[in-house]
């Protein structure tokens, strides 16, 4: 059975957009005007995982690229990466756990918690032009709140 997906962009709570930084990294920075076209468009797929009224499991692929955000241990630390997959097999309803994020809606803001590493979140730095990363703290210096903008297919 086909997986349900939608196209969207994400901005952090400081309105920084996400753009590619090299082939396997995202960074967050403020964009304006025509530069907004640089921001990555995600194909957000609704996948197997823990689901409730305010929590929906999703996978975040880059639209029309065979790249997905995934969470893995690197040097014993949960780490966010862009992982290349076989486009014949992805997306699928039952993604490997490292690709799954719990999309949590709180006060019209979104958090993306790793299913593989509970209490670790997609995060951005306060500073401009820094990598998007997996952070283990909420409510501190780093930003874990996002807004989503729908993009027509």
């Amino acid at each position: 059975a086909p997986v349900r997906s939608l196209n969207c962009t994400l901005r952090d709570s400081q309105q920084k957009s996400l753009v590619m930084s090299g082939p396997y990294e995202l960074k967050a920075l403020h964009l304006q005007g025509q530069d907004m076209e640089q921001q990555v468009v995600f194909s957000m797929s609704f996948v197997q995982g823990e689901e409730s009224n305010d929590k929906i499991p999703v996978a975040l692929g880059l639209k029309e690229k065979n790249l997905y955000l995934s969470c893995v241990l690197k040097d014993d630390k949960p780490t966010l990466q862009l992982e290349s997959v076989d486009p014949k097999n992805y997306p699928k309803k039952k993604m490997e756990k490292r690709f799954v994020f719990n999309k949590i809606e709180i006060n019209n803001k979104l958090e993306f918690e790793s299913a593989q590493f509970p209490n670790w979140y997609i995060s951005t730095s306060q500073a401009e032009n820094m990598p998007v990363f997996l952070g283990g703290t909420k409510g501190g210096q780093d930003i874990t709140d996002f807004t989503m903008q729908f993009v027509s297919s």
């Epitope: 059975a1 086909p2 197997q48 995982g49 823990e50 689901e51 409730s52 499991p57 097999n89 699928k92 309803k93 039952k94 490997e96 756990k97 490292r98 593989q116």
Partner: antibody
Framework: QVQLQQWGAGLLKPSETLSLTCAVY????????WSWIRQPPGKGLEWIGE???????NYNPSLKSRVTISVDTSRNQFSLSLSSVTAADTAVYYC?????????????WGQGTLVTVSS | QSVLTQPPSVSVSPGQTASITCSGD??????AFWYQQKPGQSPVLVIY???KRPSGIPERFSGSNSGNTATLTISGTQALDEADYYC?????????FGGGTKLTVL
């Protein structure tokens, strides 16, 4: 309370087609996947396949050439057809619901129907 | 298609802790589920998404999943826990069950 009630022929001859139907009572029909699983006597469970309300299916490759799962949303029912049965298809057949709240796994099961294939 | 391997049988004394394992290639990168089946009855989901309990399942049932092994743990095992237990995961978009473990409460 969700209930799955299943029925169908219990005794078949080799080469005949197995047909089972499962009716769903209580809860929404369109928000779930609907599955069939079988269990040969004294053995383990084998997943046969699943369907959603729109009729989109996913089958176990080992049975795919012989299996059809269909849905009748107007009656909240789904059905299993298995063609060209042999003695190896003798099993208890279960229908089940796969729910998003339990991670798309099988949280409600029918009572099971023993299907015996014998000449 | 991957294989999920369970021990055929596990024995435990009442009040003790029973552990049933399920092994499979990179199983920890998938979600694991556990079912209990008593003779003549349909299976019942006891653990979903590695470690979550459906409503109505006692707290003595818990689960974990990492590496190549998922484990169902029953603490303070009771006579009524005697049953067959099946692990389940998915592989290549199909559901796969382990061969089952018969839990005997001595």
């Amino acid at each position: 309370q969700v209930q799955l009630q299943q029925w169908g022929a219990g005794l078949l001859k080799p080469s005949e087609t197995l047909s089972l139907t499962c009716a769903v009572y209580g809860g929404s029909f369109s928000d779930y996947y609907w599955s069939w699983i079988r269990q040969p006597p004294g053995k383990g469970l084998e997943w046969i396949g699943e369907i959603d309300h729109s009729g989109s299916t996913n089958y176990n490759p080992s049975l795919k050439s012989r299996v059809t799962i269909s849905v009748d949303t107007s009656r909240n029912q789904f059905s299993l057809s298995l063609s060209s049965v042999t003695a190896a298809d003798t099993a208890v057949y279960y229908c089940a619901r796969a729910s998003p709240s339990s991670g798309w796994t099988l949280d409600y099961w029918g009572q099971g129907t023993l299907v015996t294939v014998s000449s | 298609q991957s294989v999920l391997t369970q021990p055929p049988s596990v024995s435990v004394s009442p009040g003790q802790t029973a552990s049933i394992t399920c092994s499979g290639d990179k199983l920890g990168d998938k979600f694991a589920f556990w079912y209990q089946q008593k003779p003549g009855q349909s299976p019942v989901l006891v653990i979903y998404l590695d470690n979550k309990r459906p409503s109505g399942i006692p707290e003595r049932f818990s689960g974990s999943n990492s590496g190549n092994t998922a484990t169902l743990t029953i603490s303070g095992t009771q006579a009524l826990d005697e049953a067959d237990y099946y692990c389940q995961a998915w592989d290549s978009n199909i559901e796969v069950f382990g061969g089952g473990t018969k839990l005997t409460v001595l």
